[in-house]
């Protein structure tokens, strides 16, 4: 199963990171994609370790663990993230997580 | 500064053993996997072996497999190269380096500790 | 193991200059899953330890200055140093970084006339 934060927030110009939990017994983790939206932010894989976007290399780091770091907070971050953990022999989870940026006070 | 400091090479015979360290400073080293890459007198590049951070898995190059072992103390900044039944193709340049948080690729390096093994 | 094929072995040139040095990989670099190519470009200058150039084959590296342009893709990437200067003497790999073992290429050495 995937435990997650449903909503979090964030202020603009900070950052935050972005947590999915996944537990099993028997399945081990292969891969985890993180995407905003439509759109990839960063891929994990055992084989070839954490890979991120360029559009967001200097805004999205890798971790804590399999979450991410994203920095730099803008107002247009508002919105959905999803965590997709491709895991062998379980299959495949997804989470969620609501991100809504404030301005700064 | 990212600063990588390797130690620990020198010359030995077919067959012997040494250990090459790495000091790491600047850098929360624990976050980051490590590598060891060497290049023979005049030649080019050669990748040795990995660790990763978090999950301490492991990857050796065939040449080496089974004849070397690295590791990694996290509390001490520190990366490791065992080397046993050393041969003479091994004569290098060892350098250790860092993988970057977001690409596979050496963001940073060391200046190197010579390994010459010869009888 | 993927097999990278760099050329010309060396070239030797002038200051300011164009330089072109090519890279071909025995297989694509392409990660779908992140949609960029695995290719790196580094410089080695003699004596000393190589310096990241270029990564997601034409991704300046932090503090490389950008008369070095990185191209390509698939599996033929290309590396163009536009005004090439005394100071870029040394040698240039190309490396993969879609398949474990990693892999360079031979080099290709550039000397300046």
């Known amino acids: 199963t995937i435990d997650t934060k449903r909503n979090i927030s964030a202020e603009e110009g900070g950052s935050v990171i972005l947590q999915c939990h996944f537990s099993s017994d028997t399945a081990e983790v292969t891969q985890v994609d993180w995407k905003q939206q439509d759109q990839l932010l960063a891929i994990y894989s055992v084989d070839l370790g954490w890979h991120v976007a360029s559009v967001f290399s200097d805004r999205v780091v890798p971790g804590p663990s399999l979450g991410l770091t994203f920095q730099s907070l803008t107002m247009n971050d508002t919105g959905e993230y999803f965590c997709t953990y491709h895991t062998y022999p379980g299959g495949i989870y997804k989470g969620r997580i609501f991100l809504k940026v404030q301005e700064s006070s | 500064e990212v600063q990588l400091v390797e130690s620990g090479g020198g010359l030995t015979q077919p067959g012997k053993s040494l250990k090459l360290s790495c000091e790491a400073s600047?850098?929360?080293?624990?976050?980051?996997?490590m590598h060891w890459v060497r290049q023979s007198p005049g030649k080019g590049l050669e990748w040795v072996a990995f660790?990763?951070?978090?999950?301490?898995?492991?990857f050796y190059a065939d040449a080496v497999r089974g004849r070397f072992t690295i590791s990694r103390d996290n509390a001490k900044n520190l990366l490791f190269l065992q080397m046993n039944d050393l041969k003479s193709e091994d004569t290098a340049m060892y350098y250790c380096?860092?993988?970057?948080?977001?690409?596979?690729?050496?963001?940073?390096w060391g200046q190197g500790t010579l390994v010459t093994v010869s009888s | 193991d993927i097999v990278m094929t760099q050329s010309p072995s060396s070239l030797a040139v002038s200051p300011g200059e164009k330089v072109t040095m090519t890279c071909k990989s025995s297989?694509?670099?392409?990660?779908?899953?992140?949609?960029?190519?695995?290719l790196a470009w580094y410089q080695q200058k003699p004596g000393q330890s190589p310096k990241l150039l270029i990564y997601y084959a034409s991704i300046r590296f932090t503090g490389v200055p950008d008369r070095f342009t990185g191209s390509g893709s698939g599996t033929d990437y290309t590396l163009t140093i536009t005004s090439v200067q005394a100071e870029d003497m040394g040698q240039y790999f190309c490396?993969?970084?879609?398949?474990?073992?990693?892999?360079f290429g031979d080099g290709t050495k550039l000397e300046i006339k």
């Open positions: 660790i990763r951070s978090g999950s301490g898995i492991v």
């Open positions: 490396q993969q970084g879609i398949n474990n073992p990693l892999t």
């Open positions: 297989q694509s670099l392409y990660y779908s899953g992140v949609k960029e190519n695995l």
């Open positions: 600047g850098f929360t080293f624990s976050s980051f996997t």
């Open positions: 380096a860092r993988r970057p948080l977001g690409h596979n690729t050496f963001d940073s």
